[in-house]
Amino acid sequence: SEVEYRAEVGQNAYLPCFYTPAAPGNLVPVCWGKGACPVFECGNVVLRTDERDVNYWTSRYWLNGDFRKGDVSLTIENVTLADSGIYCCRIQIPGIMNDEKFNLKLVIKPAKVTPAPTRQRDFTAAFPRMLTTRGHGPAETQTLGSLPDINLTQISTLANELRDSRLANDLRDSGATIRIG
């Protein structure tokens, strides 16, 4: 079953996906597609990296994390209700049937009329069930999925949006990444 992430109309959605390169800059190709991961490749590709760089993307889809260190989390800018659905992050590990496939469900909610809360940077030892963070760009508030449910199949940490928080290191160290090599 896919992990669920939420965002409001007009905000930026964040879909986390990580791997650990064998060496810095020694990249594994990754594709992001709209729709569940098929047997091979990604359907309806919106972004792709190769062994060197980000080599394909379409408007509104970009990487906000350090992809050369394995943070290939997808940002979707200014989402609409039509952006709801399943997204596939596929880490294309060399070899037959070695790919790691992750299906992430994006749920878009209508925009709230009330003003958004201010940036939250104080985290308690016990994770809240839902966490709202604000990123670098305009209107970049994301509501991220259920933190206690993180496991190896999710490759889901918050290191991108929380790169200036100790929580980012704690989550990445918890093992919720795929290690290559």
Epitope: V54, S59, W62, E77, H136
Partner: antibody, heavy 121, light 107 residues
């Protein structure tokens, strides 16, 4: 082929306003950010900042906050740099340069030909 | 801001020479280092990205190396058309600062 074509040279007086254009062709305008780079006479390159061509959100380097404004005319695939209340030290060549939108992809693969701005009383 | 320091400021070479241009960052930038060439009265041109990755259309005599805070641009066999100023750029942290440049001259 991909091209960034900038407007022509400008001669302005201190206190005036200038607006420099950069028209893109050969690619989908909203899939890349547009950066602006200043080069004073005989000096090196200094990044002023960049603008997200999809959202229109600008990001300014600290030295270029206040009198400087980036803007877009997406329908014309054009980006603009406006400098208000011109000073003599604004005399320079200004380049637009294409930047991928990704946070950690910050090389500039295509550049405009540059617009020379001279500020003199 | 990360300060990028290039050396030497000026380099006079003979065609056919192999030359090395140095760039040092004030803090580690991993391999987020890009090199540009600017000929007189022209726009800069991207030569190398991510410290060592070649760019389509750039002659193979240009190569880059380094990681962390020390980087080198090498020109295997200098040609007369290589004259110009070479800039390194920090691609890791905004405002993505450039070095002061190395001017390459032909003797």
């Amino acid at each position: 082929q991909i091209q960034l074509v900038q407007s022509g040279p400008e001669l302005k007086k201190p206190g005036e306003t200038v607006k420099i254009s950069c028209k893109a062709s050969g690619y989908t305008f909203t899939t890349y950010g547009m950066s602006w780079v200043k080069q004073a006479p005989g000096k090196g390159l200094k990044l002023m900042g960049w603008i997200n061509t999809y959202s229109g959100a600008p990001t300014y380097a600290d030295d270029f906050k206040g009198r400087f404004a980036f803007s877009l005319e997406t329908s014309a695939s054009a980006a603009y740099l406006q400098i208000n209340n011109l000073k003599n030290e604004d005399t320079a060549t200004y380049f637009c340069a294409r930047k991928p939108p990704h946070y950690y992809v910050n090389s500039f693969d295509y550049w405009g030909q540059g617009t020379t701005l001279t500020v003199s009383s | 801001d990360i300060v990028m320091t290039q050396s030497p400021a000026t380099l006079s070479v003979t065609p056919g020479d192999r030359v090395s241009l140095s760039c040092r960052a004030s803090q580690s930038i991993s391999d987020y280092l890009h090199w540009y060439q600017q000929k007189s009265h022209e726009s800069p041109r991207l030569l190398i990205k991510y410290a060592s990755q070649s760019i389509s259309g750039i002659p193979s005599r240009f190569s880059g190396s380094g990681s962390g805070s020390d980087f080198t641009l090498s020109i295997n066999s200098v040609e007369p058309e290589d004259v110009g100023v070479y800039y390194c750029q920090n691609g890791h942290s905004f405002p993505y600062t450039f070095g002061g440049g190395t001017k390459l001259e032909i003797k």
